[in-house]
Interface confidence: medium
């Protein structure tokens, strides 16, 4: 038996920020798990991790120099990623398990997200117009 | 046919350290949660490490944060607990046990590895 995870097929962080949900099937209220948002096609760098726990607090961190938070629904978590790079442009997979109560759970792998990040360009300013032309 | 095989146990001194291992056959671990369970005469039964799943999360009893770690490795089908900074309160018998079904309950056992740390 495994959870169902949905995400937005794509997202464009333009101020170099973006909030992914992962929506389940699965209502996460009192449970113990683990929520990570994976990088890549081979989710080989875990960005961020969100973990519950029924009777604590939540816990968010990243291991990998991602700026992130977490947020909890009962049948979602997202993820609030900032000082994104346009280098991190890539597919992100939503991951869950479930180690309480029994039996363990996790998901099937997900579509993905693709997370386009746009770089900051800077526009030239009208107070300080381009040399005019005699 | 589930079974598991815990190896490891022995005579330590007070500060020393030893390597359980748990053999799982029958299924596979990174589809549960594996368990280092231990009893001592005269003291309650106690979950002292537990991992989960193929991402590996685990808990800790209190009394052994920071000296024990678990792990395992999914190719083996093996589970792992690390004791180190070993105090005579260790001494008992570990247990490896698999798939939960009610917290701290679990279906399956392994027959035991016994610690004993005096010096």
């Known amino acids: 038996n495994k959870i169902l995870v949905k995400q937005s097929p794509m997202l464009v962080a333009y101020d170099n920020a973006v909030n992914l949900s992962c929506k389940y099937s699965y209502n996460l209220f009192s449970r113990e798990f683990r929520a990570s948002l994976h990088k890549g096609l081979d989710s080989a760098v875990e960005v961020c991790v969100v973990y519950g726990n029924y009777s604590q607090q939540l816990q968010v961190y990243s291991k990998t120099g991602f700026n992130c938070d977490g947020k909890l629904g009962n049948e979602s978590v997202t993820f609030y990623l900032q000082n994104l790079y346009v280098n991190q442009t890539d597919i992100y997979f939503c991951k869950i398990e479930v180690m309480y109560p029994p039996p363990y759970l996790d998901n099937e792998k997900s579509n993905g997200t693709i997370i386009h990040v746009k770089g900051k360009h800077l526009c030239p300013s009208p107070l300080f117009p381009g040399p005019s032309k005699p | 046919e589930v079974q598991l095989v815990e190896s490891g146990g022995g005579l330590v001194q007070p500060g020393g350290s030893l390597r359980l291992s748990c053999a799982a056959s029958g299924f596979n671990i990174k589809d549960t949660c594996i368990g280092w369970v231990r009893r001592a005469p005269g003291k309650e039964e106690e979950l002292v490490a537990r991992i989960c799943g193929e991402y590996g999360s685990t808990r800790y009893a209190d009394s052994v944060k920071g000296r024990f770690t678990i792990s395992a490795d999914t190719s083996k089908n093996t589970a792992y607990l690390q004791m180190n900074s070993l105090r005579a309160e260790d001494t008992a018998v570990y247990y490896c046990?698999?798939?939960?079904?009610?917290?701290?309950?679990?279906?399956?056992w392994g027959q035991g590895t016994t610690v004993t740390v005096s010096s």
């Open positions: 046990a698999a798939q939960p079904r009610y917290y701290d309950v679990y279906d399956y």
